[in-house]
């Protein structure tokens, strides 16, 4: 008997005292458990377990399915076991055909033998096909055949357990290996839209797509900074063997302003985790916010082009847009387009293209936009810069020389006297009177300036130059003087454009 210290409990003894035993099919299995504190016999094979409270286990007519491990346990929880093979030439293998293997792990093809003395216990491919070259296995008559380090490529592999019995090869029922892939990367998560803008009462629905190699990937919708369980619905598909897709749809049937926030779709597997967020903004009503892309006060030179550009946020989407000038609506010369093609885009651009502007086309240009909730507008004040134009140049009855010029910005009029026939007038003459004639008139268009000098100051023949100029350009008019006796006469007044 096993040597044990006095008083120390020892395991039961089983008779016959063998680790393994062969019994022929149809013969009796008789096993005796000797122990003063005998409790029970248990029998295990594949997924089957039986118990017996008698100290002698008797199976009168042994069958192949009685092959297995018989364990005797005493009241101290100590046990001894014997493995019995019931040799049945007609049933060499006990088979549990379910065969799942986790990638990179070992898996057991459960085909224990009923006769351990057969030879060449191994695996074979179905229909004579060879096994994958890198497939390694370890046979164990009591358990089956262990496939080492299962590869993803073995998925759906058809196998038989095989052994040579009396010189003939015997095959078990077939097994189909189903490989559960190992997670070698984090799940791939994406969201239907990165942000949502809704009005109160509207439905919020967002879908997260989770992609991984198998359905055992975990996923959930979470609200940031909240533990509340969200209601989600799932749809899933297997696209081929190791391409699993799940769609998790989160819905709030009637969104409220306080539902605004960041929602996270979180997924994890044994490799790691991944997440993606979407932002929900719920507003009590729609809005339009306009942002001018250029200054709303615009100065442009006569004959040049200008583009009036606005960006605006509109939610819900804009329904009507128009550009107006002097109560007239532009039907062309403008375009309106979304800032991006993104589905959640709420930003738009509107451009009014003004070409070859005339001095008379200055004024207020207004952009108006509306949606189902609000209207908004923005005005541009357009000033057309024009080169001064000398409207009149006269000698008045009171002996004054008067020059009236129009332009924008307001022209400045300078006077010069040129003695004799010289055209180079350098001696400046101070005006007697300068007035801006339409300063209180309409705010756009040309400004008219009138300037006068006293001609009595001139004692010699010569030319007087009236020079009107601003930031855009200058124009001159000339007065020629000749003395006849004591009388001074204006002769040949003419203008000279000086760019």
């Amino acid at each position: 008997q096993p040597s044990v210290s006095p008083g120390e409990p020892s395991p039961p003894s089983i008779h016959p005292a063998k680790s393994e035993l062969i019994v022929r099919v149809g013969n009796e299995i008789r096993l005796l458990c000797i122990d003063p504190g005998f409790v029970k016999w248990t029998f295990e094979i594949l997924d089957e377990t039986n118990e017996n409270k008698q100290n002698e286990w008797i199976t009168e007519k042994a069958e192949a399915t009685n092959t297995g491990k018989y364990t005797c346990t005493n009241k101290h929880g100590l046990s001894s076991s014997i493995y019995v093979f019931v040799r049945d030439p007609a049933k060499l293998f006990l088979v549990d055909r379910s065969l799942y293997g986790k990638e990179d792990n070992d898996t057991l093809v459960r085909c224990p033998l009923t006769d351990p003395e057969v030879t060449s216990y191994s695996l074979k491919g179905c229909q004579g096909k060879p096994l994958p070259k890198d497939l390694r296995f370890v046979p164990d008559p009591k358990a089956g055949i262990t496939i080492k380090s299962v590869k993803r490529a073995y998925h759906r592999l058809c196998l038989h357990c095989s052994a040579d019995q009396e010189g003939k090869s015997v095959l078990s029922d077939k097994f189909i290996l189903k490989v559960r892939p190992a997670f070698k990367a984090v799940p791939v998560v994406s969201v239907s839209k990165a942000s949502y803008l809704l009005r109160e009462g509207e439905e919020f629905t967002v879908t997260c797509t989770i992609k991984d190699v198998s359905s055992s990937v975990y996923s959930t919708w979470k609200r940031e900074n909240s533990q509340t369980k969200l209601q989600e619905k799932y749809n899933s598909w297997h696209h081929g063997d190791f391409n699993y897709e799940r769609q998790a749809t989160l819905t709030i049937s009637s969104a409220r302003v306080n539902d605004s926030g960041v929602f996270m779709c979180y997924a994890n597997n044994t490799f790691g985790s991944a997440n993606v967020t979407t932002t929900l903004e719920v507003v009590d009503k729609g809005f339009i916010n306009i942002f001018p892309m250029i200054n709303t006060t615009v100065f442009v030179n006569d004959g040049e082009n200008v583009d009036l550009i606005v960006e605006y946020e509109a939610f819900p989407k804009p329904e009507h847009q128009q550009w107006i000038y002097m109560n007239r609506t532009f039907t062309d010369k403008w375009e309106d387009y979304p800032k991006s093609e993104n589905e959640s885009n709420i930003r738009y651009v509107s451009e009014l293209h003004l070409t070859r502007l005339k001095g008379t086309e200055g004024g207020t240009y207004t952009f108006l936009v509306s949606n189902s909730d609000v209207n908004a507008s923005i005005a541009f004040n357009v000033y057309v810069n024009t080169k001064p134009e000398i409207l009149t140049y006269d000698r008045l009855v009171n002996g004054m020389l008067q020059c009236v010029a129009a332009g924008f910005p307001e022209p400045t009029i300078d006077w010069y006297f040129c003695p004799g026939t010289e055209q180079r007038c350098s001696a400046s003459v101070l005006p007697v009177d300068v007035q801006t004639l339409n300063a209180s008139g309409p705010p756009f268009g040309k400004l008219v300036v009138q300037s006068s000098i006293d001609s009595s100051a001139f004692k010699h023949n010569g030319t007087v130059e009236c020079k009107a100029y601003n930031d855009v350009g200058k124009t001159s008019a000339y007065f020629n003087f000749a003395f006849k006796g004591n009388n001074k006469e204006q002769i040949h007044p003419h203008t000279l454009f000086t760019p």
């Epitope: 063998k18 680790s19 062969i22 008789r30």
Partner: antibody, heavy 121, light 107 residues
Framework: EVQLVESGGGLVQPGGSLRLSCAAS????????MDWVRQAPGKGLEWVGR??????????EYAASVKGRFTISRDDSKNSLYLQMNSLKTEDTAVYYC????????????WGRGTLVTVSS | DIQMTQSPSSLSASVGDRVTITCRAS??????LNWYQQKPGKAPKLLIY???SLQSGVPSRFSGSGSGTDFTLTISSLQPEDFATYYC?????????FGGGTKVEIK
């Protein structure tokens, strides 16, 4: 060649001791459960005792007639089985056989030729 | 201990005879019974194990039967080399006891 060869027999006085050896060859000795069987001159076979292999935790069992006097041991590294006999009695005179058990049954499928132990004053 | 009783203790037979030897156990030993043949000055030789399984290399004229307490060894046609002593042995519970033996002699 698969064989068992006993040695160590001889004449010994009552109360004396003797150690028998059994050398195994041609098979994996460490896997086998091993027994000693004796046969007194002109008599039948009597089982003496056995030792299990490592899987059987090297457990030993003895016949009542020798229990406490005889000890069976083994040295797997030397492929050897031993029978230490103490307090020998005249009735222990016999041919002592070393025998092998097969893996899956208790029987004696291989025997040595035996060694004679004579206990006499 | 389990007692094994063999009968007859001896028998005389001629070459070609059918010979039957019986062995009875004092309690049920299922099929845990073995038969051995021993010739003078030689070690025993295993003939039958597990009551009815023929050991490799043993002629098929030897057969065994029985289960529980009663067992039989049959030699269907006695051959000159079969004259020997035959022993049964139970291998259910230690001590693994032998029967007293049956000596088969030439008539």
């Amino acid at each position: 060649e698969v064989q068992l060869v006993e040695s160590g027999g001889g004449l010994v006085q009552p109360g004396g001791s003797l150690r028998l050896s059994c050398a195994a060859s041609g098979f994996t000795f460490s896997d086998a459960d091993m027994d000693w069987v004796r046969q007194a001159p002109g008599k039948g076979l009597e089982w003496v005792g056995r030792t299990r292999n490592k899987a059987g935790s090297y457990t030993t069992e003895y016949a009542a007639s020798v229990k406490g006097r005889f000890t069976i041991s083994r040295d797997d590294s030397k492929n050897s089985l031993y029978l230490q006999m103490n307090s020998l009695k005249t009735e222990d005179t016999a041919v002592y056989y070393c025998a092998r058990e097969p893996k899956y049954w208790i029987d004696f499928d291989l025997w040595g030729r035996g060694t004679l132990v004579t206990v006499s004053s | 201990d389990i007692q094994m009783t063999q009968s007859p203790s001896s028998l005389s037979a001629s070459v070609g005879d059918r010979v039957t030897i019986t062995c009875r156990a004092s309690q049920s030993i299922s099929s845990y019974l073995n038969w051995y043949q021993q010739k003078p000055g030689k070690a025993p030789k295993l003939l039958i194990y597990a009551a009815s399984s023929l050991q490799s290399g043993v002629p098929s004229r030897f057969s065994g039967s029985g289960s529980g307490t009663d067992f039989t060894l049959t030699i269907s046609s006695l051959q000159p080399e079969d004259f020997a002593t035959y022993y049964c042995q139970q291998s259910y519970i230690a001590p693994y006891t032998f029967g007293g033996g049956t000596k088969v002699e030439i008539k």
